[in-house]
Interface confidence: low
């Protein structure tokens, strides 16, 4: 279930998912889980998950091979989730393989994680 953005598509605000024990602390930014590598087949669907939390709520950018990911209606999209952000690619093609990186910032700190789609 995607949100297909048309403006500033590389920016996805996220929820402060793990804030329950952090509410009275100063700002923080945490990578909750390293991104998973994906091995899949042509024509299938792949999902990459960027699991981050922070205060203030972080902004997430997606990159493929160091270039911002551009969404394609009904095929390649990403959106905010309750744990960060999810990138979904449908109907995989050989050109979709590569290094995918999510970069999260809360205005003070930056965290990132990289996964490989092959």
């Amino acid at each position: 279930q995607e949100t297909e953005l048309s403006v500033s598509a590389e920016l996805v605000p996220t929820s402060s998912w793990n804030i329950s024990s952090e509410l009275n602390k100063d700002s923080y930014l945490t990578l909750d889980e390293p991104m998973n590598n994906i091995t899949t087949s042509l024509g299938q669907t792949a999902e990459l998950h960027c699991k981050v939390s922070g205060n203030p709520p972080p902004t997430i950018r997606w990159f493929k091979n160091d270039a911002p990911v551009v969404q394609e209606p009904r095929r390649l999209s990403f959106r905010s989730t309750i744990y960060g952000s999810r990138l979904r690619i449908r109907n995989l093609d050989t050109t979709d393989t590569g290094y995918f990186q999510c970069v999260a910032t809360n205005g003070k700190e930056v965290v990132s994680s990289t996964g490989v789609l092959f």
């Epitope: 605000p13 998912w17 804030i19 998950h49 709520p57 905010s80 309750i82």
Partner: antibody, heavy 114, light 107 residues
Framework: QVQLVQSGAEVKKPGSSVKVSCKAS????????MHWVRQAPGQGLEWMGW????????KFNHKFDGRVTITADKSTSTAYMELSSLRSEDTAVYYC???????WGQGTLVTVSS | DIQMTQSPSSLSASVGDRVTITCQAS??????LIWFQQKPGKAPKSLIY???SLANGVPSRFSGSGSGTDFTLTISSLQPEDFATYYC?????????FGPGTKVDIK
């Protein structure tokens, strides 16, 4: 095609425990959260907690005061929710739901009655 | 805990009517809100994510607006299959909390 199939209805005595299962297919359990939500008859929805089966992390609604345990068996792609010290007000339909609440199980009715 | 209130608690409407349901949070939740539809005996179905984003496969007559503490679900032209109960859910802070629901029935 994502499917969450839950175990069947249960009737329990006050003070006992119930364990409800949720088997996932078409869905990678280890890299997604699984939520549990309940709904008393004629009432609204209440979030109970989640598990992240990839590392076993869990988060609970403090309202349940330690009565809820959520586990997962990665080998069978099944999540479990156990509620202990049952009381009559725990009579409800219990649902499992995927990370973003986009897929739900069919629900399991748990009746607590003496 | 963040308290979620919905209004009205129930409403009667006719096919073709424009229906508006509001959800209010007791504190700022940004855009971290989901709207659900539930029919009797069925599991809830997500309609709107992140306050304004339509879920996959949901008809465009449904729309969401708002941020912070005040949110609205609008059905632009009510259809027979839309008679149901609607819930909002905040996922800004633990515990996640649902609104009490708004039942939409036939006038």
């Amino acid at each position: 095609q994502v499917q969450l199939v839950q175990s069947g209805a249960e009737v329990k005595k006050p003070g006992s425990s119930v364990k409800v299962s949720c088997k996932a297919s078409g869905y990678t359990l280890t890299t997604n959260y699984m939520h549990w939500v309940r709904q008393a008859p004629g009432q609204g929805l209440e979030w109970m907690g989640w598990i992240y089966p990839g590392n076993g992390n869990t988060k609970f609604n403090h309202k349940f005061d330690g009565r809820v345990t959520i586990t997962a068996d990665k080998s069978t792609s099944t999540a479990y929710m156990e509620l202990s010290s049952l009381r009559s007000e725990d009579t409800a339909v219990y649902y499992c739901a995927t990370s973003d609440f986009d897929y739900w199980g069919q629900g399991t009715l748990v009746t607590v009655s003496s | 805990d963040i308290q979620m209130t919905q209004s009205p608690s129930s409403l009667s409407a006719s096919v073709g009517d424009r229906v508006t349901i509001t959800c209010q949070a007791s504190q700022d939740i940004g855009n971290n809100l989901i709207w659900f539809q539930q029919k009797p005996g069925k599991a809830p179905k997500s309609l709107i994510y992140f306050a304004t984003s339509l879920a996959n496969g949901v008809p465009s007559r449904f729309s969401g607006s708002g941020s912070g503490t005040d949110f609205t679900l609008t059905i632009s032209s009510l259809q027979p299959e839309d008679f149901a109960t609607y819930y909002c859910l905040q996922y800004r802070e633990y515990p996640l909390t649902f609104g009490p629901g708004t039942k939409v029935d036939i006038k």
